[in-house]
Structure formats: structure tokens, C-alpha cells
Interface confidence: medium
């Protein structure tokens, strides 16, 4: 029987040009972690391998990085980064568990406002 | 120790098919996760595909550039795993290697890389 639970940083937002950190957390369960999958629709991002470590897919090493602990850091975002992030838990003996995250990236405020607090 | 052995590399024309193998063998050997890995002449190794024990059963992982011509496979009675490789191109030309962790001893082992040339 599957008792755990996934708590996942849920819906967020980061400036274009920033980074974020895609946090999530399986409580509630004794059962072993054996891989997280991080996706992004249907595109494979990374893997952490509980033993054969992480794993960035070749178009995102150079915006996306390990870390910290299950978490992924994404980097240099752009408006395109926008939208659902899953991580995938793959435990034993449980099963598959899933969270969501919800990423929005908007506009710089520096770039959108920055006129406006010109010092005269 | 576990020793890997992989096998099935070669020559093969563009649209052909491979099938790699990579036997483990070592005193009470029983597999938590394996995974195959690839290496192009002057650039980083990088992750293929991985299977991993997931609740009763197992699950697997694609990298995206692979996702649907090759399948990642282990027969668990021979401590041995497989990869198909159907529809082969040439930006798969590598070197392919095999690890595999030990349950016992959490920690992976390396084969010695089969070496796989898509060419005309």
C-alpha cells in the first residue's frame, strides 16, 4: 500500500534571467528512493539515480543543475520556461510517486518599471 | 568486486539495429539499478537509458535523443541486461558502457565500454 505523500514548492513564479529552485519531498513512507525523474511536459530533464547519481539531459546542462538534495535549479530563465514541472519518485517497494509544480516566468520588474525610479 | 563485460558493438549502417549486452558477474550479485551510458569522441559521457527496481516491478528511463529507438531490458537470472537499438544514426556513434549498482554495496560499477560506429 502506497502511504506516501509528495509536498512540492506548488505554483511559483521567477523573473526572466533569474533562477529557480523546483523543490520536492516525499514524506510519509519508510520506502527507498531508487530514482526522481525531473520532467518538464513530456520532456526528460534529469534523473538522480540514488546510485548512479545525476543525470542532466544534453539540451538543458547548461541551464539546469543538481540540486540542492532532490531539487533541481534551473537557470537563465525564459517566458518559454513557463509552465508544469513533474518530479517522479520511483521507490521500493512502494511504486511511482508524482508532484506538480506550476512555474510562470514573467517579465523582468527592472526592465518592465525601471523608468519609472530614475533618480532626477 | 562485480566485473561488467559489454558486448554487441560494431559496424552498422544508418537505419540498422544493434543489440548490446553487458553481463555482471560477482558473489551475490543482485541489481538495484542499470543504466547505459555513452561517449562521443571529444565529448562528455553522457546518460542513454536506465532501468530501476519500482515498487514490485521495474521502470524505465529514456534519454530524449533515444526515446522510442532504443529499449533498455535485464534478465534478472542471468545477471545480464541488454540494449536494443533499432533505427541507429550516426550522432549515435560512441562508445557505449554499462553500470550497475549492487544493492548490498550501494555503489556502481563501470564496464569497459563496447564501441558502436553508425556509418555507410
Known amino acids: 500500500m502506497m502511504t506516501g505523500t509528495i509536498e512540492t514548492t506548488g505554483n511559483i513564479s521567477a523573473e526572466k534571467g533569474g533562477s529557480i529552485i523546483l523543490q520536492c519531498h516525499l514524506s510519509s513512507t519508510t520506502a527507498q528512493v531508487t530514482q526522481v525523474n525531473w520532467e518538464q511536459q513530456d520532456q526528460l530533464l534529469a534523473i538522480c539515480n540514488a546510485d548512479l547519481g545525476w543525470h542532466i539531459s544534453p539540451s538543458f546542462k547548461d541551464r539546469v543543475a543538481p540540486g540542492p538534495g532532490l531539487g533541481l535549479t534551473l537557470q537563465s530563465l525564459t517566458v518559454n520556461d513557463t509552465g508544469e514541472y513533474f518530479c517522479i519518485y520511483h521507490t521500493y517497494p512502494d511504486g511511482t510517486y508524482t508532484g506538480r509544480i506550476f512555474l510562470e516566468v514573467l517579465e523582468s520588474s527592472v526592465a518592465e518599471h525601471g523608468a519609472r525610479f530614475q533618480i532626477p | 568486486e562485480v566485473q561488467l563485460v559489454e558486448s554487441g558493438g560494431g559496424l552498422v549502417q544508418p537505419g540498422g539495429s544493434l543489440r548490446l549486452s553487458c553481463a555482471a558477474s560477482g558473489r551475490n550479485f543482485r541489481r538495484n539499478s542499470m543504466g547505459w551510458f555513452r561517449q562521443a569522441p571529444g565529448k562528455e559521457r553522457e546518460f542513454v537509458a536506465v532501468i530501476t527496481r519500482s515498487g514490485g516491478g521495474e521502470v524505465t528511463t529514456y534519454a530524449d535523443s533515444v526515446k522510442g529507438r532504443f529499449t533498455i531490458s535485464a534478465d534478472n537470472s542471468k545477471n545480464t541486461a541488454y540494449l536494443q537499438m533499432n533505427s541507429l544514426k550516426p550522432e549515435d556513434t560512441a562508445v557505449y558502457y554499462c553500470?550497475?549498482?549492487?544493492?548490498?554495496?550501494?555503489?556502481?560499477?563501470w564496464g569497459q565500454g563496447t564501441l558502436v560506429t553508425v556509418s555507410s
Open positions: 553500470a550497475m549498482s549492487s544493492v548490498t554495496r550501494g555503489s556502481s560499477d
